[in-house]
């Protein structure tokens, strides 16, 4: 995403971040020398979450809310250096990076309450299907997460072979330049899917915004 | 008022096939997450399938896996269950229900069909 | 698979009375994942409760849920004779969502 503006403000964190953050300190406190297996780590955070309840978990909120404020608040007077605004090129006939368990799920129950709530902003709309994922059980996960999983597997497949054939303008910027880091470039492509994957769902949350129908 | 009926039940020999239909009315069928139970005789309830609001995504018990597909029709606002190879312990009446949310505990059922196997 | 199990198989009482139906899970149960069901003979099975102890649509405040691990309880405060029946917990926290074999309430 090249080297963004240091004035810009920090990105607002979420409830599950300022979780994770608590669970890294924690850890370093009773660990100061042990170096930490991320995968390990993230996967007991992940469980350790699952299990919380509402309440243990209402002190994260708070401090997501409260992030979000002051992020909203220094937006406000963030002026955002000349040229920033220009969209990285995308190629149209790039393999789209497939959807989350969770995105999955969102498609099936977006209508329901969509049409049960048919004044809900679609910030409010997303709310509820996060909590009715986090409320949802792990077994009833279990098809979005299998279909997730089928679509990734395709997805490398697919990204493996587009990157195989090469990109349609690599030809033209010279081989030396196009081999310039294969490992950040990869980085900033999975950033990239990952925010169109975040713009992909908004744009389906204002299609829908415009054809709207008990709990 | 929602309402659930089940059709297709009768007497079946072992091997055979069968499709079960609920009919749902009363609510947004679409909207939501719909399964069979079934009850066989002097026995409790043993769930048998369920099937996401879209009919995308679908799950089942061991003793229906390789045998027994659900289906839905949103624009018909029916639930099926397509039966094969039937065997004398799948006797039983089989309800369909609605799950309230998106787990698996259902606040609707029918009144039941009951499939009889036997030669 | 997880294993719902009930005590006792048949419970005798009479209107008026408190009824305290069990239910046993063979290993340990977030409660959010418990419900429990009314059935009447001929008729569609009802939910009373799910998540532990949330009464469904309808259900009357004399039916109430409570329980953890695996020890979760149906408790009727006073038998109102529409209340006979057989009673049903389920786990719905891990597939294959099992019931128990059921409490049969009857008239003593």
């Known amino acids: 995403m090249g080297k963004g503006d240091p004035k810009k403000p920090r990105g607002k964190m979420s409830s599950y971040a300022f979780f994770v953050q608590t669970c890294r300190e924690e850890h370093k406190k009773k660990h100061p020398d042990a170096s930490v297996n991320f995968s390990e780590f993230s996967k007991k955070c992940s469980e350790r979450w699952k299990t919380m309840s509402a309440k243990e978990k209402g002190k994260f909120e708070d401090m997501a809310k409260a992030d979000k404020a002051r992020y909203e608040r220094e937006m406000k007077t963030y002026i955002p250096p000349k040229g920033e605004t220009k969209k990285k090129f995308k190629d149209p006939n790039a393999p789209k990076r497939p959807p989350s368990a969770f995105f999955l799920f969102c498609s099936e129950y977006r209508p329901k309450i969509k049409g049960e709530h048919p004044g809900l902003s679609i910030g409010d709309v997303a709310k509820k299907l996060g909590e009715m994922w986090n409320n949802t059980a792990a077994d009833d996960k279990q098809p979005y997460e299998k279909k997730a999983a089928k679509l990734k597997e395709k997805y490398e497949k697919d990204i493996a072979a587009y990157r195989a054939k090469g990109k349609p303008d690599a030809a033209k910027k010279g081989v030396v330049k196009a081999e310039k880091s294969k490992k950040k470039k990869e980085e900033e492509e999975d950033e990239e899917d990952e925010e169109d994957e975040e713009e992909e769902e908004d744009e389906e949350d204002e299609d829908e915004e415009e054809d709207d129908d008990d709990e | 008022e929602v309402q659930l009926l089940e059709s297709g039940g009768g007497l079946v020999q072992p091997g055979g096939s069968l499709r079960l239909s609920c009919a749902a009315s009363?609510?947004?069928?679409?909207?939501?997450?719909m399964t069979w139970v079934r009850q066989a005789p002097g026995k409790g309830l043993e769930w048998v399938s369920s099937?996401?609001?879209?009919?995308?995504?679908?799950i089942y018990a061991d003793s229906a896996k390789g045998r027994f597909t659900i289906s839905r029709d949103n624009s018909k606002n029916t639930l099926y269950l397509q039966m094969n190879s039937l065997r004398a312990e799948d006797t039983a009446v089989y309800y369909c229900a609605r799950a309230l949310s998106t787990g698996s505990f259902w606040d609707y059922w029918g009144q039941g069909t009951l499939v009889t196997v036997s030669s | 698979d997880i294993q719902m199990t009930q005590s006792p198989g048949t419970l005798s009482l009479s209107p008026g009375e408190r009824a305290t139906l069990s239910c046993r899970a063979s290993?340990?149960?977030?409660?959010?994942?418990v419900a429990w069901y009314q059935h009447k003979p001929g008729q569609a099975p009802r939910l009373l409760i799910h998540g532990g102890s949330t009464r469904a649509t309808g259900i009357p405040v004399r039916f109430s849920g409570s329980g953890s691990g695996t020890d979760f309880t149906l408790t009727i405060a006073t038998l109102e004779p529409e209340d006979f029946a057989v009673y049903y917990c389920?786990?719905?926290?891990?597939?294959?969502?099992?019931f128990g074999q059921g409490t049969k309430l009857e008239i003593k």
């Open positions: 290993e340990s149960l977030t409660s959010t994942y």
């Open positions: 009363g609510f947004t069928f679409s909207y939501y997450m």
């Open positions: 389920q786990q719905y926290g891990s597939s294959p969502y099992t």
């Open positions: 099937i996401s609001p879209s009919g995308g995504y679908t």
